[in-house]
Interface confidence: medium
């Protein structure tokens, strides 16, 4: 059974505050089931950005439609950056359960924001 | 509907503790950032504390760092402020906050508990 | 730290009549700026967020304009309910949050 992979490939995104960041992430396999999330940081000091499943991310959207069927990308995109938005954006699976465990990361996006030019 | 009710404000002296308690209810409280806000006698609005939605991230206002210890309980939907060595100028309405989403504003306020710390 | 000045400290004002106050940050917060609403007594109530959007249940005689380091809340045609103490706050750099020292509006 080949192992599942998380896949974030930018290492680094740059942002004028105020405008729009995509972050991509797209999975290798549709198993195990569970839920994808969006985390800014890691470890127990971690910022929820997204969580398809319940709670309301108004300034995220995903890029593809998560309930689509065999759907294997959950980009995100953040609107409205503000220099507190800069981080390490992490996509991480779950496996679905009670609660859902985690399963997987990918390796992080470096979100920079830079200075709206005037 | 959201609600926040916070809990355990009450008369205290100088040096001594006391917990408050925000209970939440009407939203998905683990997904959200929690804050303590408080409010001195006849004064603004001077921010407290901030903890991110898994309780593992926390801040502090100048004032209150290495005194005050916020925490949460997703389970039970609670949000809590431990205030240690506590001082008069500490008296003040507290107020618990949800914030919009992880770096926003407040959009919802509970009622405010009472502190005060008098000799 | 970002700086929110609040002027007037007061400001008294006849039913109907426009009631406009302003928000100054000594730095640009961008549209990262909210106003709240204190009634005596009462905890604060969000009014607007972003800078120009009404929070659910706002009735529309509140507005909100500005960007970068210069904005408005107006009342267009003032309620007697709508005396209270206004305070912007910025979210733009954090931590801190900060508010503004609020202005307290009277009905004249």
């Known amino acids: 059974e080949e192992e599942l992979q998380v896949i974030q490939p930018e290492k680094s995104v740059s942002v004028a505050a105020g405008d729009s960041a995509t972050l991509n992430c797209t999975v290798s396999s549709l198993i195990p089931v569970g839920p994808i999330q969006w985390f800014r940081g890691a470890g127990p000091g971690r910022e929820l950005i997204y969580n398809l499943k319940e709670g309301h991310f108004p300034r995220v959207t995903a890029v593809s439609d998560p309930t689509k069927r065999n759907n294997m990308d959950f980009s995100i995109r953040i609107s409205n950056i503000t220099p507190a938005d800069a981080g390490t954006y992490y996509c991480v699976k779950f496996r679905k359960g009670s609660p859902d465990v985690e399963l997987k990361s990918g390796a992080g996006t470096e979100l920079s924001v830079r200075a709206k030019p005037s | 509907d959201v609600q926040l009710v916070e809990s355990g404000g009450g008369v205290v002296r100088p040096g001594e503790s006391l917990r408050l308690s925000c209970a939440a209810s009407?939203?998905?409280?683990?997904?959200?950032?929690m804050n303590w806000v408080r409010q001195a006698p006849g004064e603004g609005l001077e921010w407290v504390s901030r903890i991110n939605s898994g309780g593992g991230g926390t801040d502090y206002a100048e004032s209150v760092k290495g005194r005050f210890t916020i925490s949460r309980d997703n389970s039970e939907n609670t949000l809590y402020l431990q205030m240690n060595s506590l001082r008069a100028e500490d008296t003040a309405v507290y107020y618990c906050?949800?914030?919009?989403?992880?770096?926003?504003?407040?959009?919802?306020w509970g009622l405010g508990a009472l502190v005060t710390v008098s000799s | 730290e970002t700086v929110l000045t609040q002027s007037p400290a007061t400001l008294s004002v006849s039913p109907g009549e426009r009631a406009t106050l302003s928000c100054r940050a000594s730095q640009t917060v961008g549209s990262k700026l909210a106003w709240h609403q204190q009634k005596p007594g009462q905890a604060p109530r969000l009014l607007i967020y972003d800078a120009t959007n009404r929070a659910t249940g706002i009735p529309d005689r509140f507005s909100g304009s500005g960007s970068g380091t210069d904005f408005t809340l107006t009342i267009s045609s003032l309620q007697t309910e709508d005396s209270a103490v206004y305070y912007c706050q910025q979210y733009y750099y954090w931590p801190p949050y900060r508010f503004g020292g609020g202005t307290k509006v009277e009905i004249k």
């Open positions: 906050a949800k914030q919009y989403d992880w770096n926003g504003f407040f959009d919802y």
């Open positions: 009407g939203f998905s409280f683990s997904s959200y950032a």
